[in-house]
Amino acid sequence: SETTTGTSSNSSQSTSNSGLAPNPTNATTKAAG
């Protein structure tokens, strides 16, 4: 079974979570207008 998200027991969902998408600057220029 795959790893779960969206629960406090998961380390990826801990309070250290920035909540931010990657938003890489080198990719933004490729986005469709």
């Epitope: 998200t5 990826s12 309070t15 979570n17 998408a21 938003n23």
Partner: antibody
Framework: QVTLKESGPALVKPTQTLTLTCTVT?????????VSWIRQPPGKALEWIGY???????RYNPSLKTRLTISRDTSKNQFVLTMTNMDPVDTATYYC??????????WGQGTTVTVSS | DIVMTQSPLSLPVTPGEPASISCRSS????????????LTWYLQKPGQSPQLLIS???TRASGVPDRFSGSGSGTDFTLKISRVEAEDVGVYYC?????????FGGGTKLEIK
């Protein structure tokens, strides 16, 4: 248990300013995550409005940026969305949702806002 | 902005049968730094708020039945339901959680035949 709940006026007039509040329970809004505002016009898809991070920093959708302010009240564990110059096309259900680094994992129930004279 | 395109628009399915929803993005959602695809799936049941199903293209959220699975990479993604149940009705949305502004697909309405 994490919960988010939106509140605000159901009806606003064109050109008026909309103020919505998102009250969070189950975690401290200064401890992590972002909270985004997302809207959904009747029968249509979802549109991301903007977020406020646990640090207080904000980011807005460029299509709405000039009309938006997202702020917070840490003492009340609340976020506030202010949208100026409302128009009938802004009629929608407005949601607040907690953002992780990969998704919106908790959503509010939504509040329906109608813009009409 | 990244454009998210879903198909089909409507999906009538017989209970117990499989279902598949496609989502395409106008640019790659694969982040080179961590090799993850920042593609998320949500289900909005009638009269309810959206709920998280799958993040990082294939990681099921807590409590989501294993009949739901996500796959794909880059710009082409798929949500599959192995055996549709009556409770699965609603509108399915894909979303890119990669570059701001975050954007959603137009939705796929799953209905029971």
């Amino acid at each position: 248990q994490v919960t988010l709940k939106e509140s605000g006026p159901a009806l606003v007039k064109p050109t008026q300013t909309l103020t919505l509040t998102c009250t969070v329970t189950g975690y401290s809004i200064t401890s992590g995550y972002t909270v985004s505002w997302i809207r959904q016009p009747p029968g249509k898809a979802l549109e991301w409005i903007g977020y406020i991070q646990y640090t207080g920093s904000t980011r807005y959708n460029p299509s709405l940026k000039t009309r938006l302010t997202i702020s917070r009240d840490t003492s009340k564990n609340q976020f506030v969305l202010t949208m100026t110059n409302m128009d009938p096309v802004d009629t929608a259900t407005y949601y607040c949702a907690r953002g992780t680094t990969a998704s919106f994992d908790y959503w509010g129930q939504g509040t329906t806002v109608t813009v009409s004279s | 902005d990244i454009v998210m395109t879903q198909s089909p628009l409507s999906l009538p399915v017989t209970p117990g049968e499989p279902a598949s929803i496609s989502c395409r993005s106008s640019q790659s959602l694969l982040y080179s730094s961590d090799q993850k695809n920042y593609l998320t799936w949500y289900l909005q049941k009638p009269g309810q708020s959206p709920q998280l199903l799958i993040s990082w293209a294939s990681t099921r959220a807590s409590g989501v039945p294993d009949r739901f699975s996500g796959s794909g990479s880059g710009t082409d993604f798929t949500l599959k339901i192995s055996r549709v149940e009556a409770e699965d009705v609603g509108v399915y949305y894909c979303q890119q959680y990669f570059i701001y502004p975050l954007t959603f697909g137009g939705g796929t309405k799953l209905e029971i035949k």
